[in-house]
Interface confidence: medium
Amino acid sequence: AQGKEVVLLDFAAAGGELGWLTHPYGKGWDLMQNIMNDMPIYMYSVCNVMSGDQDNWLRTNWVYRGEAERIFIELKFTVRDCNSFPGGASSCKETFNLYYAESDLDYGTNFQKRLFTKIDTIAPDEITVSSDFEARHVKLNVEERSVGPLTRKGFYLAFQDIGACVALLSVRVYYKKCPELLQGLAHFPETIAGSDAPSLATVAGTCVDHAVVPPGGEEPRMHCAVDGEWLVPIGQCLCQAGYEKVEDACQACSPGFFKFEASESPCLECPEHTLPSPEGATSCECEEGFFRAPQDPASMPCTRPPSAPHYLTAVGMGAKVELRWTPPQDSGGREDIVYSVTCEQCWPESGECGPCEASVRYSEPPHGLTRTSVTVSDLEPHMNYTFTVEARNGVSGLVTSRSFRTASVSINQTEPPKVRLEGRSTTSLSVSWSIPPPQQSRVWKYEVTYRKKGDSNSYNVRRTEGFSVTLDDLAPDTTYLVQVQALTQEGQGAGSKVHEFQTLSPEGSGNLAV
């Protein structure tokens, strides 16, 4: 942003009314009026080019410094070419000197040269030659100087003529401020420019109404340079939730729009299945029957639980059932659908029913399924099973109703074998089993699965047509998990429960029966 100039003294604007002091009085500098562009202008002029040594002073009125630290002095002046005078005017000069003096009070007409400090010798870029003078072409020069830091209540400027033909048309003294500024939704107050060229004054900004510093963000700051320019912006403000940036302000979201957090983004239209929001909304409420999960962004449409799985089949394979289903016809507007499978078993003789989660085995965990099939094994024979597949999504927990479909299946399979440990040694286990005689004719073979307890990565399988097996090459003093399962023409029969059998330690090496 451009620096703001605060004028302390403007000779050209004063219309000759300032009454500056000339020394010596009545000689040297003189207030003159002229016409330029058909307008009267005033100037302080001196042209004693033929009179030898000159020491003519022109002093301004006392200027109150106010809050200024560094002042800028802009001079507009014209200087005649010494060669334009007869004989070249040997004592003629083409420069003058600029001075200043600080003081806490106005000395009035008491002029003392010794109090003044020289700022610079002022030389023209262009002198007015005879032809320009004749044609009334004023070759106006503009020079600027600065002084600071100033510390007293006020100051004077003075112009020393040493024998030039010069006219001062404008003397403007001002200081610079960094202007009031709105940037990054932060307000920076008008700030006086510092006095030292390398230094930058750090200025804290204030967020405009309904704007905030974002979490973890830097507070807005800018730097006011000597020339009144704002530099190096740091940090910013953002429109708070419910408000959006419109030019340099934060404006409430219009009805039907919302903004859920402080950000640079504009207000968004309320998503589907929401009620029209009021002005300045941070979110849009869901229509009846629609919900928003805690993790759902406010920009997401409101959703509802899914309908039941569309189509469910249960195909029995021995002591296993494969369940298959298709996704719900109505997803509720969400993609985070998962399925839960629950199992109920009923005894045909008594008609009693109960949950069977503990006794069956699923091909993958039955809750939070994302696929649309699962295999259930270890089903008991002569049992009726009912499987329930429930579809759920992120908002199902917000309602009490459930969306599910059920399928029933009867199992006509072998009962699980009853397993006994017949004997053991340090390196072997002898195992036997039995099943009810009516089912024996359906059994083709028995499958013995065993593994060390705690070792889930590897297991061993032995198949036999008999009712016993000795498991060799085992580790001493080690517990093994052993299960026996009948294999029928229809597939796998029910497995026995898993037994824990331990080999002997090397000390007690006798072959003991249990």
Partner: antibody
Framework: EVQLLESGGGLVQPGGSLRLSCAAS????????MAWVRQAPGKGLEWVSR????????HYADSVKGRFTISRDNSKNTLYLQMNSLRAEDTAVYYC?????????????????????WGQGTLVTVSS | DIQMTQSPSSLSASVGDRVTITCRAS??????LAWYQQKPGKAPKLLIY???NLHTGVPSRFSGSGSGTEFSLTISGLQPDDFATYYC?????????FGQGTKVEIK
């Protein structure tokens, strides 16, 4: 010594024309602004026209605008005034006058000029 | 146009007298004023320019003062050669105008 010598005056009928000349010597003619000033018999001085050192700009009094033309020939050190559509009230002694800013010790020239050097004048009589 | 009014139109004075002629402008002309002396049958001669500056070769008994609209020409000790008509001229505007003249006669 600066000398300005006017010529070309005389008796002329109303509506007629005359051309006045002013021969300059003793100074650098091309540095001077030149003018014509007239004085009716028994009356005061009246500025008529001016011309810049190199031939422009030119200015005229309202009373002669459109009828008189000022010009100069710096190679001949001569100033001219062409007077057309002459009227009885143009009867006067016509003076050639000059101004050199080098002798004007001011930093900014006045909006117009005064006249440092004058010729002896030539009489123009407009009468039927 | 700017009108220049001189007073008096004429005056009688003796050698050695102090004589003052005034010139009033119809609007401010700062110090852009010149004074001329004219003798019968002769061309005018420049005396003063810029209200108070004496032209080269003019005796120091002649002086000028004033600014704005009021100006004066003073002859501090009238000499026989000074009996003539005196004119003021403004050069604040392109239509340079003269006063009507003041005739200084021997008493």
């Amino acid at each position: 010594e600066v000398q300005l010598l006017e010529s070309g005056g005389g008796l002329v009928q109303p509506g007629g024309s005359l051309r006045l000349s002013c021969a300059a010597s003793g100074f650098t003619f091309s540095h001077y602004m030149m003018a014509w000033v007239r004085q009716a018999p028994g009356k005061g001085l009246e500025w008529v026209s001016r011309i810049g050192p190199s031939g422009g700009p030119t200015h005229y009094a309202d009373s002669v605008k459109g009828r008189f033309t000022i010009s100069r020939d710096n190679s001949k050190n001569t100033l001219y005034l062409q007077m057309n559509s002459l009227r009885a009230e143009d009867t006067a002694v016509y003076y050639c006058a000059g101004y050199d800013s080098g002798y004007d010790y001011v930093a900014v020239a006045g909006p117009a000029e005064y006249f440092q050097h004058w010729g002896q004048g030539t009489l123009v009589t407009v009468s039927s | 146009d700017i009108q220049m009014t001189q007073s008096p139109s004429s005056l009688s004075a003796s050698v050695g007298d102090r004589v003052t002629i005034t010139c009033r402008a119809s609007q401010s002309i700062s110090t852009w004023l010149a004074w001329y002396q004219q003798k019968p049958g002769k061309a005018p001669k420049l005396l003063i320019y810029k209200a108070s500056n004496l032209h080269t070769g003019v005796p120091s008994r002649f002086s000028g003062s004033g600014s704005g609209t009021e100006f004066s020409l003073t002859i501090s000790g009238l000499q026989p050669d000074d009996f003539a008509t005196y004119y003021c001229q403004q050069y604040n505007a392109y239509s340079r105008t003269f006063g009507q003249g003041t005739k200084v006669e021997i008493k």
